[in-house]
């Protein structure tokens, strides 16, 4: 009686169970009563990931220059290409399909988590006691100035984007 | 087919300001970076300025706030803002599509600051 | 801001000649180095990417090297179509935020 499922990395074809391609090959031709599976590997710039009867490979992403991209893996016959972002550039989706700026902490802000090829710069407003007077993907927030550690005196308050100006204390005659 | 094209340009007084457009076709400014460039007549290539392809931009030191670089998606269509404008602006303004290197550029529109 | 310092200015040259110009930046910029061809009158053209990949539809007689500070580019043997002003570019992202893309001051390749 012919089989309704077959084993794990087989197929059914033509009522009888038939062994999958590997990765990195192709389906040439199915089996048949006498013969196995036929496949083949896939060409230099082609892939496929998983046991398959694919009678044709994926082609290998292709990282645009002109969008950014630039290759961070080179694909193999079981894997394909990851792209990444050039320097100063990240990924706007898991896909790396296009790159975008890095992002600046603006005064008020400083930098949490510093940008990569695959993400932005993560911001984060200053709390108090601290302050960034700047825009800038790298600086944190830096905290004011102690003026006691000085022997000064606080003359003007610290914001979240200035520093304490600190002044000497007043002399008692 | 893919190009862009500039227009806008003309005379303008000292201190004037003038907005640059650079229509672009055959691909999506959704998809990839433009930049502006400048080139003074008979001299060599100045950047200027750039839009990513999700509106981020970036600027060239000496703008100083001075020009501001938008876009249209919907037009598909880049603008170059230029406020304050003085005699060393006098270029021919291109607008080039890229990342780290331009590989497709407009024919440019001429902007002459004179009085 | 990175300067990029392009010789010769001017380079008098034959049909047939072997053509070299160099740039050099003034911190290292790694490969992010292109080279432009400008006819009077035209815009740019974009003939080496990334130091060394010639760009689509550009003639093998053109080559880039180079990494870093110092850049060449080759032009194998001159052509009647190769006499024009050549430029280079750099790319610089200083990590701060803060991107730079400087221009050499150009080259003119002119008939000797």
């Known amino acids: 009686e012919p089989p309704t499922a077959c084993r794990e990395k087989q197929y059914l074809i033509n009522s009888q169970c038939c062994s999958l391609c590997q990765p990195g090959q192709k389906l040439v031709s199915d089996c048949t009563e006498f013969t196995e599976t036929e496949c083949l590997p896939c060409g230099e710039s082609e892939f496929l990931d998983t046991w398959n009867r694919e009678t044709h490979c994926h082609q290998h992403k292709y990282c645009d220059p002109n969008l950014g991209l630039r290759v961070q893996q080179k694909g193999t016959s079981e894997t394909d290409t990851i792209c990444t972002c050039e320097e100063g550039w990240h990924c706007t989706s898991e896909a790396c399909e296009s790159c975008v700026l890095h992002r600046s902490c603006s005064p008020g802000f400083g930098v949490k988590q510093i940008a990569t090829g695959v993400s932005d710069t993560i911001c984060e407003p200053c709390p108090v006691g601290f302050f960034s007077n700047v825009s800038s993907a790298f600086e944190k927030c830096h905290p004011w100035t102690s003026c006691e550690t000085k022997d000064l005196v606080v003359q003007q308050a610290g914001t979240n984007k200035t520093d304490v100006v600190c002044g000497p204390q007043d002399r008692l005659r | 087919e893919v190009q862009l094209v500039e227009s806008g340009g003309g005379l303008i007084q000292p201190g004037g300001s003038l907005r640059l457009s650079c229509a672009v076709s055959g691909f999506s400014l959704s998809t990839y970076a433009v930049s502006w460039v400048r080139q003074a007549p008979g001299k060599g290539l100045e950047w200027v300025g750039i839009?990513?392809?999700?509106?981020?931009?970036a600027y060239a030191s000496w703008v100083k706030g001075r020009f501001t670089i938008s876009r249209d998606n919907s037009k598909n269509t880049l603008y170059l803002q230029m406020n304050s404008l003085r005699a060393e602006d006098t270029a021919v303004y291109y607008c080039?599509?890229?990342?780290?290197?331009?590989?497709?550029w407009g024919q440019g529109t001429l902007v002459t600051v004179s009085s | 801001d990175i300067v990029m310092t392009q010789s010769p200015s001017t380079l008098s040259a034959s049909v047939g000649d072997r053509v070299t110009i160099t740039c050099q930046a003034s911190q290292s910029i790694s490969n992010y180095l292109s080279w432009y061809q400008q006819k009077p009158g035209k815009a740019p053209k974009l003939l080496i990417y990334r130091a060394s990949d010639l760009a689509s539809g550009v003639p093998s007689r053109f080559s880039g090297s180079g990494s870093g500070t110092e850049f060449t580019l080759t032009i194998s043997s001159l052509q009647p179509d190769d006499f024009a002003t050549y430029y280079c570019q750099a790319y610089y992202y200083s990590g701060g935020g803060s991107y730079d893309y400087a221009f050499g001051g150009g080259t003119k390749v002119e008939i000797k």
């Open positions: 839009i990513d392809s999700g509106g981020g931009t």
């Open positions: 080039a599509r890229g990342v780290t290197f331009f590989g497709l």
